[in-house]
Interface confidence: medium
Amino acid sequence: KLTIESTPFNVAEGKEVLLLVHNLPQHLFGYSWYKGERVDGNRQIIGYVIGTQQATPGPAYSGREIIYPNASLLIQNIIQNDTGFYTLHVIKSDLVNEEATGQFRVYPELPKPSISSNNSKPVEDKDAVAFTCEPETQDATYLWWVNNQSLPVSPRLQLSNGNRTLTLFNVTRNDTASYKCETQNPVSARRSDSVILNVLYGPDAPTISPLNTSYRSGENLNLSCHAASNPPAQYSWFVNGTFQQSTQELFIPNITVNNSGSYTCQAHNSDTGLNRTTVTTITVYAEPPKPFITSNNSNPVEDEDAVALTCEPEIQNTTYLWWVNNQSLPVSPRLQLSNDNRTLTLLSVTRNDVGPYECGIQNELSVDHSDPVILNVLYGPDDPTISPSYTYYRPGVNLSLSCHAASNPPAQYSWLIDGNIQQHTQELFISNITEKNSGLYTCQANNSASGHSRTTVKTITVSAELPKPSISSNNSKPVEDKDAVAFTCEPEAQNTTYLWWVNGQSLPVSPRLQLSNGNRTLTLFNVTRNDARAYVCGIQNSVSANRSDPVTLDVLYGPDTPIISPPDSSYLSGANLNLSCHSASNPSPQYSWRINGIPQQHTQVLFIAKITPNNNGTYACFVSNLATGRNNSIVKSITVSA
């Protein structure tokens, strides 16, 4: 059947439309297009004769129409008047006629809308505001947006005038937002610029800060007032009813008891004409003396001395308080308070007891703090550490060793090589070392105040060729699915590459395997029984390579769910019952049996001769692995028939 398709159906003014013909019959003589729903010579647009390929304009031809050999009609530069129906009249070679009608609609391209308002400064809880979307356009849909969201559902929001007008009744400060309107028709959509609604409100009841109402003589009084208000409020201060000043802040330096009284803040909004006030009562107290701490030992020795700290001055009927590291006193058997809390004794001080310590005297208003006191605890030296941790160096490099021991006062250091004193410095430096510099390097740390000294010895080997490495492990018996194991390739040597093999193969790619510390450390996370393999590390440098002996990881696992064999569950009376229990476990588990819940023997095999129906019941095998701390069990029902 002959049909007409309009592309597009909705056409914007000034654009073009194609009336596309479908199912055009064969053997045509020609065709004509007409404006309207029927063939009317007065409304012919154009005719076309196929034989001559001649197009002939009709009375309704506007010069904007183009006819194609396939009978489709293109209309350009569309105007509003073009809206409507178009009829195609087809004349076949046998002079039989056929007709089809199509249609399209024309819409204007919408202009960018704007918003007009009937009230630019509405007052909260009093005014209404009506926004209107301009211009008024026929066949247009109007939409509204608040803060780029569609309109919320609210009884205070009302759309009217075909949605062209948005009214906000009884505006609130929360209506201060960005408003946009949008016009839409089938061919265009345009959004307006934002209009910000400026709602006048307040002032709310002012708040005075800080909330503190008690002050000490000699302090500064600094009160600040704030009230939510649009436009911002103007502030006034009154003390005991007497006007002081028109500022947001009230500042009185070095107050005395005479400054006690009622302080009023008044907030005024000139646009809404409203006033609000808030009153606070300020009390000023006389100044007590500032406390201080005395100590019976200014340089106590760690693990030897006790220290008594006393809070001065002594005042009758006063509460004394103490703080360590800005915290209240921790519970500790080494901390003792006297009956009146004025003296704090530290028994057997440690280096962690340095403080700072503060004491306080409590009065009706506040707590007066002393200045902090820090204890100078003498300690150490601890065992010195020599860095770097390398034990192998290649010839020709510089050897630079540094020694450090925790100590107060700081330790004095001495270096010995193979027992011979070298120098009294914290660092030892030897340039361009050779094999002859191999030996025992001792660092001695001495604390002149405590008189204590400690030493650490490190073996240094100077060789271009690396030694046979060994593997150290942080966990010799890890538990499956629980523990991690870190293997470290020893020794630590400069300019050295570290390599690893598992069962003679290079490391597999696995998220549970991680190399760190310059590949010197291999960590296996969440070990499994399959990780019980031979691990080898290798070291190499410019002239040598060497491999460690294998280390086999002993992974503790299980017990898994046991299996009872044989699987038979039905027996004849008089037969022997011989049940064996097995569970995968490392180390081997301990086995025990229960029959109908009653404990039997602690063996892997349960044997009962010449069973009878009395032996019917549930047979449970229990397994436990003392190393992993895990247990497991299985239950089997046995039926004995007579």
């Epitope: 050779t434 060789s463 040598s544």
Partner: antibody, heavy 120, light 106 residues
């Protein structure tokens, strides 16, 4: 297959300089150290030193300090030995040697050698 | 530098003989390595880290020793073993070689 191909033999005059090449195939020289050695007529092997092609670090035997210079062109996978101020006693076969273990075992690959003859 | 002295400097043996070559170091070393060089050829690694056979080396070759004294042994000499054998130390710079032991087969 690992192979080290050295440049051909040459005759040079005393006081002259020469640059020998060693082209590697079957491995990337950046993963190795390249050693250079020489062997005079009827003499023992002498180690000249090594270069790390990855960063250009070098180690020279004291005897060859100032005489030998190691360089590499990693894009050409080639190592070079420069010899300066040549004297008749520098007449020798010069070898390049990939002397670094790349696994748990030693792998020692040698070039075929280049004969340098110093003669007027 | 660490001087390596090999003995003997040359020897002539029959097929099937057991041969031992000694290498003495002027300073103690943790390991010794052995190379084999046939006339007109490049050296080839024979034994590394004192006693480990390099890839493809027959088991009749073995190495031992410690400190300053090391040795290479061929348990049953074969005609293809005719070559010069060098010991090498890699413990101190410069790396050094022995003077070589030339092995001839009668």
């Amino acid at each position: 297959q690992v192979k080290l191909e050295q440049s051909g033999a040459g005759v040079v005059k005393p006081g002259a300089s020469v640059k020998l090449s060693c082209k590697a195939s079957g491995f990337n020289i950046k993963d190795s150290y390249m050693h250079w050695l020489r062997q005079g007529p009827g003499q023992r092997l002498e180690w000249i030193g090594w270069i790390d092609p990855e960063n250009g670090d070098t180690e020279y035997a004291p005897k060859f300090q100032g005489k030998a210079t190691f360089t590499t062109d990693t894009s050409a996978n080639t190592a070079y030995l420069g010899l300066s101020s040549l004297r008749p006693e520098d007449t020798a076969v010069y070898y390049c040697n990939e002397g670094t273990p790349t696994g748990p075992y030693y792998f020692d690959y040698w070039g075929q050698g280049t004969l340098v003859t110093v003669s007027s | 530098q660490n001087v390596l002295t090999q003995s003997p400097s040359s020897m002539s043996v029959s097929v099937g003989d057991r041969v031992t070559i000694a290498c003495s170091a002027s300073s103690s070393v943790p390991y010794m390595h052995w190379l084999q060089q046939k006339p007109g050829k490049s050296p080839k690694l024979l034994i590394y880290l004192t006693s480990n056979l390099a890839s493809g080396v027959p088991s009749r070759f073995s190495g031992s020793g410690s400190g300053t004294d090391y040795s290479l042994t061929i348990s049953s000499v074969q005609p293809e073993d005719a070559a010069t054998y060098y010991c090498q130390q890699r413990s101190s710079y410069p790396l050094t070689f022995g003077g070589g032991t030339k092995l001839e087969i009668k």
